[in-house]
Interface confidence: medium
Amino acid sequence: GSERTCCPVNWVEHERSCYWFSRSGKAWADADNYCRLEDAHLVVVTSWEEQKFVQHHIGPVNTWMGLHDQNGPWKWVDGTDYETGFKNWRPEQPDDWYGHGLGGGEDCAHFTDDGRWNDDVCQRPYRWVCETELDKASQEPPLL
């Protein structure tokens, strides 16, 4: 595929990545799939500067990010190392709370109203942010 050198229409460029901010809500898996269909992934936050940039756009609204522990350990969807990477959890989070009565614990991470992170039930219909890196090979076939 060809390298992406500029962001798609309605995406915002920042530090060699492109971001798309939803205005509706989906379950985490549906949001994850939406981003993948756009040749992107749910946002992966690697620094305080990126955290601030994303929060600037989403405001004080619960919003999914590309971080989950559905298979055990916490993992970023793009393979970024969780243990050594940037974190911005709320105090006492993540807590894998079972008291919500929806079955199971809490396996998906989201931005809360103050920007810090919380784990929650993955089926909740929150807004989401997609991210794709510039200069990566896109999956589109080359023009003939």
């Epitope: 500029c6 460029e13 940039f53 929060q55 405001g59």
Partner: antibody
């Protein structure tokens, strides 16, 4: 040290378009990570955010002014510009340009330029 | 349109302590609003004092501090100096990359 300097006509006639330019020195607009902003202050009043632009060209405007505002960037000149159309006397104000860093907020400001709308 | 509200005016004695607040019509101000505070003296451009609730710029005097207080952003001046007499503005960030300034507080040092 980043410095910003506004320039443009100090007098604009009603119904015309106000045009201002902000020249940035001490740092490159195209280095990324910053929003280049316009703010105004009516005489004796508070500050009003007009809008800003990212170096890639993405713009964000105050909803109350959106229909009349255009902000553009010229990275080759390290400048960004404001155009405000169909001005009236109510647009008479000191216009400031400023840099907004997602990490450090509105940290650097120009000294401001007074624009009077009068025939 | 979001409205950001500040006390129109406050008076403090030299050496005293005063707290200015900043409220949002959308509800409680949180750290996710990344409150900024600015000082403006007559005939001058605003000067940034505080960013992201409580962080000081390198030029911000130690007597200025920012915090969240009862659902509002707050700027506290401790050991007020005569040169602190000025207008003070807060700024809040909102979703969609929008920002809004407060109406300003005129601080008089008597």
């Amino acid at each position: 040290q980043v410095q910003l300097q506004e320039s443009g006509p100090g007098l604009v006639k009603p119904s015309q378009t106000l045009s201002l330019t902000c020249t940035v020195s001490g740092g490159s607009i195209s280095s990324g990570g910053y929003y280049w902003s316009w703010i105004r202050q009516h005489p004796g009043k508070g500050l009003e955010w007009i809008g800003y632009i990212y170096y890639s060209g993405s713009t964000y405007y105050n909803p109350s002014l959106k229909s009349r505002v255009t902000i553009s960037v010229d990275t080759s000149k390290n400048q960004f510009s404001l155009k405000l159309s169909s001005v009236t006397a109510a647009d008479t104000a000191v216009y400031y340009c400023a840099r907004d860093s997602p990490l450090r907020g509105f940290d650097y400001w120009g000294q401001g330029t007074l624009v009077t709308v009068s025939s | 349109q979001t409205v950001v509200t500040q006390e129109p005016s406050l008076t403090v004695s030299p050496g005293g302590t005063v707290t200015l607040t900043c409220a949002s019509s959308t509800g409680a101000v949180t750290s996710g609003s990344y409150p900024n505070w600015f000082q403006q003296k007559p005939g001058q451009a605003p000067r940034a004092l505080i960013y992201s609730t409580s962080n000081k710029h390198s030029w911000t005097p130690a007597r200025f501090s920012g915090s969240l207080l009862g659902g509002k952003a707050a700027l506290t001046l401790s050991g007020v100096q005569p040169e602190d007499e000025a207008d003070y503005y807060c700024l809040l960030y909102y979703g969609g990359a929008q920002v809004a300034f407060g109406g300003g507080t005129k601080l008089t040092v008597l």
